[in-house]
Interface confidence: low
Amino acid sequence: KIDACKRGDVTVKPSHVILLGSTVNITCSLKPRQGCFHYSRRNKLILYKFDRRINFHHGHSLNSQVTGLPLGTTLFVCKLACINSDEIQICGAEIFVGVAPEQPQNLSCIQKGEQGTVACTWERGRDTHLYTEYTLQLSGPKNLTWQKQCKDIYCDYLDFGINLTPESPESNFTAKVTAVNSLGSSSSLPSTFTFLDIVRPLPPWDIRIKFQKASVSRCTLYWRDEGLVLLNRLRYRPSNSRLWNMVNVTKAKGRHDLLDLKPFTEYEFQISSKLHLYKGSWSDWSESLRAQTPEEEPTGMLDVWYMKRHIDYSRQQISLFWKNLSVSEARGKILHYQVTLQELTGGKAMTQNITGHTSWTTVIPRTGNWAVAVSAANSKGSSLPTRINIMNLCEAGLLAPRQVSANSEGMDNILVTWQPPRKDPSAVQEYVVEWRELHPGGDTQVPLNWLRSRPYNVSALISENIKSYICYEIRVYALSGDQGGCSSILGNSKHKAPLSGPHINAITEEKGSILISWNSIPVQEQMGCLLHYRIYWKERDSNSQPQLCEIPYRVSQNSHPINSLQPRVTYVLWMTALTAAGESSHGNEREFCLQGKAN
């Protein structure tokens, strides 16, 4: 009943709670003297389903048979309509449509930790749409039973609040869950288990790692576990990896030696526990321990290259370059590089520690045989030194690689190809391809890049430190014992026409011809490798086509003579520059009048 129902009653048969698909009879009847005031036959009783009229009848009572009610709750309300007045609510009723509970499935119980309590879960099956009571029963040895109820419509979990103890770990316990509502009841199949089956240990805690003598090869992982734990699983991985290494250990008693860790690497460690070899379940993984392994002395050898520059008749400048060791080779933080320079015949040697750089420059006499050794040092020791004899890398003409070419290969890559030297190609021990940004004036501060290539290779793809629209000076060295030959070429990964032409800074007269001097185009405006300069000239105030002279680009050249100008004629001159992609705009214009005699 949904209100006081002072004026009448609504009855529902067979019940307020019905099985889905059933029919109900709803009767609305007025109490004596509760009809319309003047004339009772004018009583009009109306039955509403929620707020929609479904039936009406004149008189003291109304019968209605209702079918097809949906799952859930439906509200019926009976109202009285009298002439010249609003409808009056008489009474109402809620009808609950549902189904009997299905048999609960997959009943499983667990006790989290040796001190935890037994809790069970199950699958309810389809929703009953009715108030359903679940009773969970646990029976154990010595006729002990425990019972817990839950009256939640969605109940699928109950905690007994009792703790199973390991006194008799093989004793059997049986759990069963029963669901009951107004339309029926159903029980799960019994689930039988022992202490060892259902206790899921707590994850290990207080995880620590120790490195004996600060060595990665003597590493022990420690943790704490509940008392009955028999098995542990360890998993660990470098922090930047997605793949775990797994180890299973028995009777570890809270410690395990790890033998395969890499030095100077941050690792993540987790541990899980189990009480029995084949019974029960694994604990959750522990919290992660993150720890960095100690350093070990570097392995591997530095890749060292060098450059020689003539200073004067007695001195030369040597610039050494080397590449960082990989993380796996450095095995720690590299604190410094040790460079040793030695004159081989006289035995003089100097050693220097370099920090913060991967290059070193010094001046040595042009006489004598010189060698260098470079090694990397961390807190545990040094790498094996890389030894190089300083030689004239381009001295042996017969060792010079032939037909060197450099072609753009996609974004920011250059493919360098060559042919083996004329001299017996089998004499070549390795090729070195070297590249650096082309700077007029040969700036020695420009970073040097190189890669080594096996003697049977005749190409190399260079991609490190390659930028678009920049011209690179590329050299290919063929090395054989203490001899070397080289060839060079200019190359770029991407080019377009230069943004500006050269700036003519002077025109001077020399014996009936002129010498034009210009400033180089700024590197950032060259837009790749320059192939040619063009010098244009025409008579001032003339509409004729200008004449031109095309000069192959050479890095160091910034002047050129022209001897085809007529004396005492004023000319306008300008210059452009060309890459493979096209010609620049004009540089500045200069006027000049040759003063010399006519031919």
Epitope: W205, D206, I207, R208, D284, S286, E287, S288, L289, R290
Partner: nanobody, 127 residues
């Protein structure tokens, strides 16, 4: 490196309540712990309370005997924030309260086990 910022400290009367917050930013992990320590003038820093996150849930809380039953630690993993609810405050609770975080798992109340520290927030309880 985890950065920690405490807030909520102020002057209160004995018997009052106060809630401190500690927000963590930077490199945070799915498994680590956060705790509160305090240092009264002229005294050593002492442990107050700590909790452990495990995969986003708090699976363990721990209190110093002197605050048990009066202080409560909680956290919001989504916000990387830990709170210290302090009830029935006493004059002896006056101190600078520091938030600390650790990715190591050792003794909870040992300040050497914590790798990151906040600047501290002053709590003064007047009687």
């Amino acid at each position: 490196e985890v950065q920690l910022v405490e807030s909520g400290g102020r002057l209160v009367q004995a018997g009052d309540s106060l809630r401190l917050s500690c927000a963590a930013s930077g490199r945070t992990f799915t498994s680590y712990r956060m705790g509160w320590f305090r240092q009264a003038p002229g005294k050593e820093r002492e442990f107050v309370s700590a909790l452990r996150w495990s995969s986003g849930n708090i699976d363990y809380t721990y209190y110093a005997d002197s605050v048990k039953g009066r202080f409560s630690i909680s956290g919001d993993y989504a916000k990387n924030t830990v709170y210290l609810q302090m009830n029935s405050l006493k004059a002896e609770d006056t101190a600078v309260y520091y938030c600390a975080a650790s990715t190591r798992w050792g003794v909870m109340e040992s300040d050497t086990e914590y790798t990151s520290w906040g600047q501290g927030t002053q709590v003064t309880v007047s009687s």
